[in-house]
Interface confidence: low
């Protein structure tokens, strides 16, 4: 018998209270199907029901978590139904409080190098799941290390390529409720750097300014970068600006830092909109120093 194909949109990881569409596709073109849930809590709205094309399930509760299969109508089968489809595991998030996700040594990773993603929580999660935004396949399942203060897992990812870069979140779960996940961690952008030549970074009016004076950092390159990213050493985030084509043929972005009070080492990177997590080599560091202030970083 032809097995239909079951899929979940927008994905298999669903926040509590949201909806998920289960779609059952038959290669023979039959669009009526039944759904069954293999494990977890019962979902009475599936029993003895025939669905057409797709089923919008929700608002999702933890009871919806589990493994689903569909059977499509099949007039030539003795039972009137196809063989069961592939399994789809629906995981429901928001059941436990969120864990934290960190990158060691940091979220900017040189092409070819390795980064360690650490998910940790003060809840004793026996399992962690690592999920990359925009990926429909199942999240990576990791076994947590339990300790008195909670739990954690370290995942070594590499060698780094653009295919591995992206926005990551992690979830925790407990053994008895494998498909009922915590709220997601705050997102962590893992960026691969070193894919293109480095841009140049300069400061106007200059790299040494009076405390309270305005300074603008300009990042430019002859490469066709759409976006420039400015980062300050020892700081997590980055500023992001669209590149503008200048008369001299360079693509440039000006970062007005406003009245500065503290200096620091700055670097900029270039990237393309189509690959937002793949950046150039860093520019040479530009030390900005502030006079008339006791703290020079």
């Amino acid at each position: 018998q032809d097995k239909p194909f079951l899929s979940a949109w927008p994905g298999t990881v669903v926040s509590e209270g949201q909806h998920v569409t289960l779609q059952c596709r038959s290669r023979l073109g039959f669009n009526e199907f039944s759904l069954s849930k293999e494990d977890g809590m019962p979902v009475p709205e599936l029993y003895n029901r025939i669905f057409r094309n797709s089923f919008l399930m929700g608002p999702v509760t933890p009871a919806h978590a589990g493994t689903y299969r569909c059977c499509s109508s099949h007039p030539h089968s003795p039972t009137g139904w196809s063989a069961p489809s592939n399994p789809v595991v629906i995981m429901v998030t928001g059941v436990h409080r969120k864990p934290s996700l960190l990158a060691h040594p940091g979220p900017l990773v040189k092409s070819g190098e390795t980064v360690i993603l650490q998910c940790w929580s003060d809840v004793r999660f026996e399992r962690f799941l690592l999920h990359r935004e925009g990926i429909t396949e199942d999240p990576l399942r990791l076994v947590g290390q339990l300790h008195d203060a909670g739990s954690q897992v370290n995942y070594s990812m590499g060698p780094m390529t653009p295919a591995l870069a992206g926005t990551y979140r992690c979830f925790g779960s407990v053994t008895h409720l494998p498909y009922e996940l915590s709220a997601p961690s705050d997102p962590l952008d893992i960026v691969v750097v070193g894919l293109y030549g480095k841009p140049s970074l300069s400061a106007q009016p200059g790299p040494t300014v009076q405390a309270g004076e305005n300074v603008t950092l300009s990042c430019s390159s002859r490469s066709l970068f759409d976006i420039y990213h400015l980062s300050r050493e020892a700081e997590a985030g980055e500023l992001r600006l669209t590149a503008v084509l200048r008369v001299n043929g360079t693509f440039q972005a000006n970062f007005p830092l406003g009245p500065v009070t503290h200096g620091g080492n700055y670097r900029c990177f270039g990237s393309f909109r189509a690959l937002p997590h793949a950046w150039s080599d860093p520019s040479d560091p530009l030390p900005v120093s502030v006079t008339g202030n006791s703290r020079h970083l």
Epitope: S36, K37, E38, D39, G40, M41, P42, P62, T67, V95, R124, V174, H176, L177, E180
Partner: antibody, heavy 119, light 107 residues
Framework: ELQLVESGGGLVQPGGSLRLSCAAS????????MNWVRQAPGKGLEWVAE??????????HYAESVKGRFTISRDNAKNSLYLQMNSLRAEDTAVYYC??????????WGQGTLVTVSS | DIQMTQSPSSLSASVGDRVTITCRAS??????LNWYQQKPGKVPKLLIY???ILQLGVPSRFSGSGSGTDYTLTISSLQPEDVATYYC?????????FGGGTKVEIK
């Protein structure tokens, strides 16, 4: 629809034996730890026995009150759970329910089968 | 074995009343606490699992809370159809144990 149908109960004399069966349908029986829970007339619920999965080598666990007298078993091919009860006592009189274990709980229950131990 | 002590053993309240049933475990059960409702002559029905997660189809007037050894089932506004005996159960460690039950009646 998920169904659990217990059978095999009845009247038996103290020291006698009975074999309870539970026919499961509507869910993947082989994926679940299966349990027997009982309820004496007018009393509360008491967990009796558990059998785990093939991957757990069908490990079994029993309440102290039935250890050595009761044996839990399963036949995944038949979607069936069994409870062999030997050396029955008056205090084993109860409705026996078969129930799968999930999420640290018993989400599905059959209608139960009544075992009466009396002379 | 983990002992589960439920209180009160019975209570009588008016329709619309807020009803609270407590369950105390003899040791920490890490939130693996479930609540069941058994109506007269019927089979037990899972209401709440893992301390506070409502089983699908259970009215939102039922809620659960607690941690460690102390857990609570609350019915925010008692309805006639809530007349039943309520049992707590720990799923943290074998042997799985139930509380003695709380019989809820309407005044």
């Amino acid at each position: 629809e998920l169904q659990l149908v217990e059978s095999g109960g009845g009247l038996v004399q103290p020291g006698g034996s009975l074999r309870l069966s539970c026919a499961a349908s509507g869910f993947t029986f082989s994926n679940y730890w299966m349990n027997w829970v009982r309820q004496a007339p007018g009393k509360g619920l008491e967990w009796v026995a558990e059998i785990r999965l093939k991957s757990n080598n069908y490990a079994t666990h029993y309440a102290e009150s039935v250890k050595g007298r009761f044996t839990i078993s399963r036949d995944n091919a038949k979607n069936s759970l069994y409870l062999q009860m030997n050396s029955l006592r008056a205090e084993d009189t109860a409705v026996y329910y078969c129930t799968p274990f999930y999420g640290s709980s018993f989400p599905y229950w059959g209608q139960g089968t009544l075992v009466t131990v009396s002379s | 074995d983990i002992q589960m002590t439920q209180s009160p053993s019975s209570l009588s309240a008016s329709v619309g009343d807020r009803v609270t049933i407590t369950c105390r475990a003899s040791q920490d059960i890490s939130n693996y606490l479930n609540w069941y409702q058994q109506k007269p002559g019927k089979v037990p029905k899972l209401l709440i699992y893992y301390t506070s997660i409502l089983q699908l189809g259970v009215p939102s007037r039922f809620s659960g809370s607690g941690s460690g050894t102390d857990y609570t089932l609350t019915i925010s506004s008692l309805q006639p159809e809530d007349v039943a005996t309520y049992y707590c159960q720990q799923g943290n460690a074998l042997p799985f144990t139930f509380g003695g039950g709380t019989k809820v009646e309407i005044k």
